[in-house]
Interface confidence: medium
């Protein structure tokens, strides 16, 4: 290995390295053989030491992480912002839908308030929780709404002479509601529409939140030591030879990056599928698959269902009178 | 008297942005999001190229660094030599993705499966029967007189500016226990700051 020329110093390298690591003791005064180096393997004398090499590796991995974060910043912001906006919008839709329904009860069936408000409130609370991922069954939510409403409708509108809120008859009436299909096909209709629209809404929000998670994961990837070595060799080893202004070759950079990102690039196939599947879902979000549409029209369907009960009131009162006779007798005692 | 903190239909925000010419619907916002996301469809496959283009790379210089020496930009050595005596790039690729990446791939597979099962098949009429069944006139039959409703045509009177329940001394929201006689619900009052309504009493 030839000795360095007599006028060679590591001055330039030293001033650059000082910016990375204040304190100059790691930079040789003049080029050295560098036999202890593991990454920037010298062809001749070098201005790098083992300690400098370690610092370069650390810096290279940090650079890579920052580059990755800046690459995903716009995408991350896009999904985070939209996830928040849609979640808030859906909550507002639910609140408006509840208000519509309460208005319908207050102005058409004042005798059913305030109990109806309570049941409506519970129903829409469950709707909100379901959208946010709660483990609630939509059919159960709808059944609970109609199960709760019917005893109030029966005791307040159809048979107002009965004493209120006696658990015995309420339980019997809840059972009768399903057995006698008191509300006709309306509960089933609401179940279908609400479950379809809420499922789609829920999965839409879940998908957006997963999108954020995907970006966050790749954003905070820690690169392997092997990758750190490759990056150091590409970005910093030229400095050891005093080549401060030279840049890596483009093709070489691509090869290194593909090596470092081999694992990350494997996400590509599933990411593409994610966007295309989300597009398909969004294209289908209308009519009964659009929760705004369904929830904001619920007041009307619930009104129709109560009218259905009223229409069949005479027959129902007779049948229920027999069916729940035992409970009623116990009440009158 | 207590007021219900939210109007049925109108939100003060409408009044503030009434001058805006183009208003977005939720569905148009969804479609816009998809269009923007589609511009990122190659995000992961393009990452290596993105990072190279955003880090110092020889573009106009005649000479460039290949990891070992200074070479001419278009020479065979420009891409090849830098990888010699280093470690096997193929080995690096063979290691497979990081555990966190594998986890996220599994989650993506799962959500993709869910999205596919939830998507409405193309060309399918969207449950037309369900969409319309029982919705036009309830189940009242042809004779509308059969329908008994406390306001005949099903109209709902809503108090002043559609703020209903104005006379009630308690809030309707079940966040408060029934019977709690409060002036407005704390939770909804918080909402009113950003989603308040018409002219409040």
């Amino acid at each position: 290995q030839p000795p360095p020329p007599p006028d060679a110093t590591c001055h330039q390298v030293r001033s650059f390295f000082q910016r990375l690591q204040p304190g100059l003791k790691w930079v040789p005064e003049t080029p050295v053989p560098g036999s202890d180096l593991q990454v920037c393997l010298p062809k001749g004398p070098t201005c790098c030491s083992r300690k400098m090499e370690e610092k370069y590796q650390l810096t290279a991995r940090l650079n890579m992480e920052q580059l990755l974060q800046s690459a995903s910043m716009e995408l991350k912001f896009l999904i985070i912002q939209n996830a928040a906006v849609f979640q808030e919008a859906f909550e507002i839709v639910v609140r408006h839908a509840k208000n519509y329904t309460n208005a319908m009860f207050k102005n058409n069936y004042p005798s059913l308030t305030p109990q109806a408000f309570e049941f409506v409130g519970e129903f829409f609370t469950d709707v909100s929780l379901y959208i946010l991922g709660s483990d609630i069954n939509v059919d159960d939510m709808v059944n609970e709404l109609f199960d709760s409403l019917f005893p109030v409708i029966y005791t307040q509108m159809m048979n107002p002479g009965l004493p209120e809120s006696v658990l015995d008859i309420n339980e019997c009436l809840r059972g009768a509601r399903r057995d006698l299909k008191v509300f006709g096909s309306f509960p089933k209709l609401i179940m279908t529409q609400v479950s379809k629209s809420l499922q789609v809404t829920r999965i839409f929000l879940q998908a957006l939140n997963l999108g954020i998670e995907v970006i966050n994961t790749t954003d905070h990837l820690k690169f392997s030591k092997d990758c750190g070595r490759m990056l150091t060799r590409m970005w910093y080893c030229s400095y050891c030879q005093g080549l401060m202004m030279v840049k890596p070759c483009g093709g070489y950079c691509n090869v290194v990056m593909q090596g470092c990102m081999a694992g990350v690039v494997e996400i590509d196939k599933y990411w593409r599928e994610y966007i295309l599947s989300l597009e398909e879902l969004v294209n289908g979000m209308y009519r009964i698959y659009d929760m705004e549409n369904v929830l904001l029209g619920l007041f009307s369907t619930i009104h129709d269902s109560i009218q259905y009960v009223q229409k069949n009131g005479g027959k129902l009162t007779t049948t229920i009178g027999k069916l729940c006779a035992h409970s009623q007798q116990r009440q009158y005692r | 008297s207590a007021y219900y903190p939210e109007d049925l239909f109108i939100d003060k925000k409408i009044l503030k942005v009434a001058h805006v010419e183009h208003e977005e619907t939720l569905s148009s916002r969804r479609r816009e999001l998809i269009q923007k996301l589609k511009s990122f469809i190659n995000f992961y496959s393009a990452l290596p190229g993105y990072i190279c283009s955003h880090s110092p790379v020889a573009e106009n210089d005649t000479l460039c660094w290949n990891g070992q020496e200074l070479v001419e930009r278009y020479s065979q050595k420009a891409a090849r030599n830098g990888m010699k005596n280093q470690f096997n790039l193929h080995e690096l690729k063979m290691k497979g993705p990081e555990p966190v990446v594998s986890q996220i791939i599994d989650k993506l597979k799962h959500i993709n499966q869910l999205l596919r099962t939830m998507s409405v098949p193309k060309g399918k009429v969207l449950d037309k029967s369900l969409d319309e069944e029982g919705l036009e006139s309830g189940d009242c039959g042809d004779d509308e007189d059969e329908c008994i409703g406390s306001s005949g045509d099903g109209m709902v009177k809503v108090k002043n500016q559609l703020r209903f329940l104005a006379e009630l001394a308690y809030d309707l929201d079940v966040d408060d226990a029934p019977g709690n006689k409060q002036h407005g619900n704390q939770k909804d009052n918080e909402i009113t700051t950003s989603h308040s309504v018409g002219n409040m009493p």
């Epitope: 507002i92 009307s300 | 239909f9 939100d11 503030k16 977005e24 619907t25 989603h195």
Partner: nanobody, 123 residues
């Protein structure tokens, strides 16, 4: 391009009647709960009535019993029949979707405001 065009307004004496229409293009309004709004000079825009996709309507007290909102899905149009008009009904009447939900600077489900139709009730 979504467009809502209101028409049918005019000058009418107290106690008179008018029927205003709102024709939509570029959107199928049969899937929306639609509403009529009005704005009197110097006043805030207020909602007057709404009609669900199934034809059920809701009204504010000030117009209850005098106004009737209806829709013709085949014509993609909603109507507001105004009877027994009063001077306080004087305003520009607009239609839009009822679920006009605003969130800060993000706005949704509004179909965009039309030019409105002027209703003047005066003797």
């Amino acid at each position: 391009q979504v467009q809502l065009v209101e028409s049918g307004g005019g000058l009418v004496r107290p106690g008179g009647s008018l029927r205003v229409s709102c024709a939509a293009s570029g959107v199928d309004i049969s899937t929306y709960t639609m509403a009529w709004y009005r704005q009197a000079p110097g006043e805030q825009r207020e909602s007057v009535a709404a009609i669900s996709t199934t034809g059920r309507s809701i009204y504010i007290d000030a117009v209850q019993g005098r106004f009737t909102m209806s829709r013709d899905n085949a014509k993609n149009t909603v109507y507001l029949q105004m009877n027994n008009l009063k001077p306080e009904d004087t305003a520009v009447y607009y239609c839009n979707s009822a679920d006009d939900l605003k969130i800060g600077t993000q706005y949704f489900k509004g179909l965009g405001w039309g030019q409105g139709t002027q209703v003047t009730v005066s003797s």
